[in-house]
């Protein structure tokens, strides 16, 4: 049902869903801190623009009695329960910041008449693509898929002269929320990735993965997996790996690779890591000082959600436009705003664009080095290291199918 919004007469409220089930196991206190830091910045920006208004956040907590797994598996109804709570209390703000779980976001979007914008730090799955009033501030699975297809097809770089059309995908069901949906998208038979590949097999058992590493009859030299180096080591250990195997490790929300003192362990030599270009001003901020790299990105998405609302509020107020309209609800897309750590770009469907970075391990220095970057906004590759010191023969990535001649 329509809920009246606390969103007029110079007072603008943000409803923040504080759900027990979350994409990342982050103490809600840290998210509150991020939101409050964002509010301070927004108030300052509005004041500087000569807009004398009040902006506040209301934190809506789940009772945690029923939905208590802590991860996203039991999140489907939690979001709806919180919406019901908001509805009963007549406390809906101008914008809803919350659910990070794909299940809950999808269900909330499906089951409610959304005449207000919804901003999510997460909702990675393909089922949350192309939603008219949903904005996602962490890279969704679709963006990953587009990079992978682009990279697979590339054959005009001195270090990648073979187009690839095959892949194994390792997915054992214990993944984090982001990895679960990234791999889910790659697995889906109707996805862009599956459509563009000639061969793709999902490996679900540790042993399957381990056997492929030295199997002379393998159908692909390329294995995609998602997680950090430790996750790979647990699986691979110090096992021998055929020289033309390439492991693509998707680890988007982890900037440890860019730290000065990091040395790549030996088991990473035949691995390409896909991560996001790191921020720099986060390290000293009050809300992120005690956060791990992954949680920093999650908290940052909450903070940027507040800044995005402030950006849109400023535009609408300056134009003398009403905030509680479908126009406002549909406006959170196809724009660039000033985020906490620099400009943030949203695509036509409200999904954040970013610079993905593909790293390799230098056999000379044992350091992670940038091979190339990829701008998801324009789907363009920018080569960085034209003569990488790879472990692979001739400093080139191998063909994806052993024994296939030059292309």
């Amino acid at each position: 049902s329509q809920v009246s919004q606390n969103c007029h007469n110079g007072s603008y409220e943000i409803s923040v869903l504080m759900m027990g089930n979350s994409a990342f196991a982050e103490p809600l206190k840290n998210l509150e801190d991020a939101v409050n830091e964002g509010l301070e910045i927004v108030r300052g920006r509005l004041q500087n623009a000569g807009l004398n208004v009040t902006v506040n956040a209301t934190f809506m907590y789940s009772d945690g009695l029923i939905h208590n797994s802590g991860d996203c598996r039991s999140s489907t109804c939690e979001g709806l329960d919180l919406l019901r709570k908001i509805s009963n209390a007549q406390r809906m703000g101008c914008v809803l910041i919350g659910p990070s779980c794909t299940y809950s976001t999808f269900q909330m979007y499906l089951d409610t008449e959304l005449s207000y914008p919804m901003i999510s730090a997460g909702s990675f799955g393909l089922s949350c693509d192309y939603k008219e009033t949903l904005t996602r501030l962490m890279s969704p699975a679709r963006k990953l898929m587009y990079f992978l297809v682009n990279f697979w097809k590339t054959n005009d770089l001195p270090f990648k002269t073979y187009s690839w059309s095959t892949s194994y995908v390792y997915k054992n069901g214990t993944e984090t929320e982001d990895c679960f949906w990234y791999l889910n998208a790659l697995e889906a038979s109707v996805s862009y990735f599956s459509h563009e590949l000639g061969f793709k097999v999902v490996l679900r058992q540790d042993k399957e993965f381990q056997d492929i590493l030295m199997d002379h009859n393998r159908k692909s030299n390329v294995i995609i997996m998602c997680g950090g180096p430790e996750f790979l080591y647990k699986l691979k250990g110090d096992r021998a790996v055929a020289e033309d195997i390439v492991i693509i490790l998707v680890d988007l929300f982890n900037d440890q690779y860019f730290e000065d003192n990091v040395t790549a362990p030996d088991y990473m030599k035949n691995v390409l890591v896909l991560t996001l270009s790191p921020g720099n001003s986060l390290l000293n901020s009050s809300f992120s000082r005690n956060l791990s790299p992954t949680k920093r990105d999650f908290a940052l998405a909450y903070l940027n959600g507040i800044l995005l609302f402030g950006h849109m509020l400023k535009i609408f107020l300056e134009n003398g436009e009403n905030i509680t309209t479908p126009k406002f609800a549909h406006a959170f897309r196809n724009l660039t705003f000033e985020g906490y750590d620099g400009p943030v770009t949203l695509d036509d469907w409200g999904d954040v664009d970013s610079t993905m970075v593909l790293l390799y391990t230098s056999v000379d220095t044992k350091k992670y080095k940038v091979l190339l970057t990829y701008d998801t906004h324009v789907n363009k590759t920018y080569p960085v290291d034209m003569s990488p010191t790879f472990t692979w023969k001739n400093s080139k990535l191998p063909n994806d199918i052993t024994g296939r001649g030059p292309q």
């Epitope: 054959n155 005009d156 770089l157 001195p158 270090f159 002269t161 080095k369 940038v370 970057t373 590759t381 920018y382 080569p383 960085v384 290291d385 034209m386 003569s387 400093s395 030059p406 292309q407």
Partner: antibody, heavy 118, light 106 residues
Framework: EVQLVQSGAEVKKPGASVKVSCKAS????????MNWVKQAPGQRLEWMGV????????NYNQKFKDKATITRDTSASTAYMELSSLRSEDTAVYYC???????????WGQGTTVTVSS | DIQLTQSPSFLSASPGDRVTITCSAS?????MYWYQQKPGSSPKSWIY???NLASGVPSRFSGSGSGTEYTLTISSLQPEDFATYYC?????????FGGGTKVEIK
């Protein structure tokens, strides 16, 4: 409009060094690799090296590894190439060229003539 | 390093002629790139990835080929086309250039 403006011609004595600059404008300097190419009189073009201004990654042609040093000043959107221990065979026109993959070397500077003569 | 051999080195032709320049690579490459250079000027990107015309290049130019043999063709030579054309590969590191083909007025 993309422009690469190089420093003026230089005449140097053998054994000296020279630093050629290439100022970029009309695009984001850190978004594109910058190449350096040598054209000696009557010789084919020779690729010397490439630098990524964002990450500072530099790859040299083995032939020029001990001859050229490539640097950059991102705040000034300028790439530099220094040539050391100059000899007569270093007499050439040196070009900077932007890499706009997949169109390698899509824009070139006007060239800097370096003459080495005693 | 991959060696690129262009033929002919010199070519005399008249306006309106069809002109073909060949570039042979010492080993197979996926793509070839072409540049035009006029006396006293810097090279200009002309054709990239074998057959894509760079911005502003007239449609009378075309590129083709695969493996070790690539060609640049001018369907009807115009006065402004008289220049030197260089082929270049970036299949292997380091990138290398051909020796050039000078197209002169007959």
């Amino acid at each position: 409009e993309v422009q690469l403006v190089q420093s003026g011609a230089e005449v140097k004595k053998p054994g000296a060094s020279v630093k050629v600059s290439c100022k970029a404008s009309g695009y984001t300097f850190t978004d594109h690799n910058m190449n350096w190419v040598k054209q000696a009189p009557g010789q084919r073009l020779e690729w010397m090296g490439v630098m990524n201004p964002k990450f500072g990654t530099i790859n040299y042609n083995q032939k020029f590894k001990d001859k050229a040093t490539i640097t950059r000043d991102t705040s000034a959107s300028t790439a530099y190439m220094e040539l050391s221990s100059l000899r007569s065979e270093d007499t050439a026109v040196y070009y900077c060229a932007r890499d706009n993959y997949p169109n390698y070397f899509d824009y070139w500077g006007q060239g800097t003539t370096v003459t080495v003569s005693s | 390093d991959i060696q690129l051999t262009q033929s002919p080195s010199f070519l005399s032709a008249s306006p309106g002629d069809r002109v073909t320049i060949t570039c042979s690579a010492s080993s197979s490459v996926n793509y070839m790139y072409w540049y035009q250079q006029k006396p006293g000027s810097s090279p200009k990107s002309w054709i990239y990835r074998t057959s894509n015309l760079a911005s502003g290049v007239p449609s009378r130019f075309s590129g083709s080929g695969s493996g070790t043999e690539y060609t640049l063709t001018i369907s009807s030579l115009q006065p402004e086309d008289f220049a030197t054309y260089y082929c270049q590969q970036y299949h292997d590191y380091p990138p290398t250039f051909g020796g050039g083909t000078k197209v002169e007025i007959k």
